[in-house]
Interface confidence: low
């Protein structure tokens, strides 16, 4: 639910014509923090798919216990299954770890639907296909959960990569990445390449397939094409950014830009869909419907409840529009745009009844907690979480799904005025982030 009163919205955004480009401040890209170039040991260290999350292999305890851990930029706890559960193949057994330390404190995390709760402790943690370091990190040992673990997802825990402000039970619990940076020489930066398959994967295919890469401490040039464009992190809690304009097939939605960020806009690898505030969602769906009007789809499709299927290999990608989100740039009055294809926002799903067909779910949905740029957005791009410089970078992913006519894009710069006014100032109520 939405909380608090709505702030008065500005009637318009002073945007210059899109043809007007700002000159680059320099021909050189500013030097990135951390190591650049090749991170061979970390490439292809993720598996999974957008509907069930992407996970990385981690080890916990002494001797090391191997677990698959969901990579989640929308939360800040490192939490692992620590008791038997019907959906878990394995779980963290604290009693078997000589380095486990009990913090004698509980943690409870309810979601709009579902919850998990557990006991806090610390232990030694490492990432086999990551930096060659071991850190002592806070761990929430999940002892009870409801609608949290996903049957068949193959992950047993969650790695919250956002900031301490949203850690549970409170911001005194240091998140894993903070511990990693503090205790080692790993630069304060990570990057994600999530690779959507473009077709449904059965269980054995998911286990065998490559899901992408989490590069810890740097940027790997082999994972993207073109340039990286950066948007400021507005506030260090979630990875909050500011969207300044939205276009469907090049047509501006023409909404007050505050609406796009009502009540925040975040980059969240732990969410499947592109989630949009109610008003924006309605306008976007109306525009997508109009653009794809050569075919009719049931209302349930647009609500994400019904599948739409085509005979194998005949999906009419060309009737669906591209979607562009303009993000605040690093330079005053400068923005850039990221453009996704229907191959990102139509999510392939298995439909047992019609296995000869290609079936899809509409992966844009309505939100009451702001815009969430989930996996369907991230699957188009290589995304750099440059915590050191408080910014997020986007470049076209080398693994994004496209066709011979269109490709995802990251382009700029564009002149956009008064971008600061696009940020929504959340009315100060404690519960504004309560039901994420």
């Amino acid at each position: 639910t939405q909380h608090g009163i709505r702030l008065p919205l500005r009637s318009g955004l002073g945007g210059a014509p899109l043809g007007l480009r700002l000159p680059r401040e320099t021909d050189e890209e500013p030097e990135e923090p951390g190591r650049r170039g090749s991170f061979v040991e970390m490439v292809d260290n993720l598996r999974g798919k957008s509907g069930q999350g992407y996970y990385v292999e981690m080890t916990v305890g002494s001797p090391p216990q191997t677990l698959n851990i969901l990579v989640d930029t929308g939360s800040s706890n490192f939490a692992v299954g620590a008791a038997p559960h019907p959906f878990l193949h394995r779980y963290y057994q604290r009693q078997l770890s000589s380095t486990y330390r009990d913090l004698r404190k509980g943690v409870y995390v309810p979601y709009t639907q579902g919850k998990w709760e557990g006991e806090l402790g610390t232990d030694l943690v490492s990432i086999p296909h990551g930096p060659n370091v071991t850190v002592r990190a806070n761990i929430a040992a999940i002892t009870e959960s409801d609608k949290f673990f996903i049957n068949g997802s193959n992950w047993e825990g969650i790695l919250g990569l956002a900031y301490a402000e949203i850690a549970r039970p409170d911001d005194s619990l240091e998140p894993f990445f903070d511990s990693l940076v503090k205790q080692t020489h790993v630069p304060n930066l990570f990057s994600l390449q999530l690779c959507g398959a473009g077709f449904p994967l059965n269980q054995s295919e998911v286990l065998a397939s490559v899901g992408g890469s989490m590069i810890i401490g740097g940027i790997d040039h082999s994972l993207y094409t073109g340039s990286l464009w950066y948007t400021p992190i507005r506030r260090e809690w979630y990875y909050e950014v500011i969207i300044v304009r939205v276009e469907i097939n090049g047509q501006d939605l023409k909404m007050d830009c505050k609406e796009y960020n009502y009540d925040k806009s975040i980059v969240d690898s732990g969410t499947t869909n592109l989630r949009l505030p109610k008003k924006v969602f309605e306008a976007a769906v109306k525009s997508i419907k109009a653009a794809s009007s050569t075919e009719k789809f049931p209302d349930g499709f647009w609500l994400g409840e019904q599948l739409v299927c085509w005979q194998a290999g005949t999906t009419p990608w060309n009737i669906f529009p591209v979607i562009s989100l303009y993000l605040m740039g690093e330079v005053t009055n400068q923005s850039f745009r990221i453009t996704i294809l229907p191959q990102q926002y139509l999510r392939p799903v298995e439909d047992v009844a019609t296995s000869q067909d290609d079936c899809y779910k509409f992966a844009i949905s309505q939100s009451s907690t702001g815009t969430v740029m989930g996996a369907v957005i991230m699957e188009g791009f290589y995304v750099v979480f440059d915590r050191a410089r408080k910014r997020i970078g986007f470049a076209v992913s080398a693994c994004h799904v496209h066709d011979e006519f269109r490709t995802a894009a990251v382009e700029g710069p564009f002149v956009t005025l008064d971008m600061e006014d696009c940020g929504y100032n959340i009315p100060q109520t404690d519960e504004s982030t309560l039901m994420t």
């Epitope: 949203i166 409170d170 100032n425 100060q428 404690d430 982030t433 309560l434």
Partner: antibody
């Protein structure tokens, strides 16, 4: 240790204003919301509003809108609650209590400030 | 506004008794419920948050349960120091609302 220390008791005439202070210590003042709750003699607890010490943003109960002002001074880790146009039924003990974002309870309370409104 | 209704408003019990206090919300509040204990002349003290999570330092004889609209605070074995007034409160939406309180007295 973590504590909230409130200003002393006040006696006010109807129509006057009162300003109660709440000094935080033992934790990062800007990391927690501050709420104000009052309790009339022999009655239950009544929520008045909250302030985000970081931004200064406030949220007031409808009942007190226009009469209450919550402020803070981060340099001295102190929150203030001012209630104007006092009436006799404003006689109560006023408490400040801290609440974390994403925490569910008011986990630390001030000792309370008794405000008596009498002509 | 979400109304919180507590029952009973008062009860008499003896040391060692199992005591149950209920709280009903006027609309579903999921698990967003807190319980507080208040002794005369003192500030309230947080016992339970999120319906069932025990606040640090609170004895394990206190427990909370429920979700949606109906919630329960249970004291498994009443101790002399537990005689006090207990309040429920919802932190889900503004205005924050408290129940009317339940006074637990010595029989």
């Amino acid at each position: 240790q973590v504590q909230l220390v409130q200003s002393g008791a006040e006696v006010k005439k109807p129509g006057a204003s009162v300003k109660v202070s709440c000094k935080a210590s033992g934790y990062t003042f800007t990391g927690y919301y501050m709420h104000w709750v009052r309790q009339a003699p022999g009655q239950g607890l009544e929520w008045m509003g909250s302030i985000n010490p970081n931004s200064g943003g406030t949220n007031y109960a409808q009942k007190f809108q226009g009469r209450v002002t919550m402020t803070r001074d981060t340099s001295i880790s102190t929150a203030y609650m001012e209630l104007s146009r006092l009436r006799s039924d404003d006689t109560a003990v006023y408490y400040c209590a801290r609440v974390r974002v994403r925490h569910y309870g008011m986990d630390v309370w001030g000792q309370g400030t008794t405000v008596t409104v009498s002509s | 506004d979400i109304q919180m209704t507590q029952s009973p408003s008062s009860l008499s019990a003896s040391v060692g008794d199992r005591v149950t206090i209920t709280c009903r919300a006027s609309q579903s509040i999921s698990s967003y419920l807190n319980w507080y204990q208040q002794k005369p002349g003192k500030a309230p003290k947080l016992l339970i948050y999120a319906a069932s999570s025990l606040q640090s330092g609170v004895p394990s004889r206190f427990s909370g349960s429920g979700s949606g609209t109906d919630f329960t605070l249970t004291i498994s074995s009443l101790q002399p120091e537990d005689f006090a007034t207990y309040y429920c409160q919802q932190p889900l939406s503004h205005p924050r609302t408290f129940g009317g309180g339940t006074k637990v007295e010595i029989k």
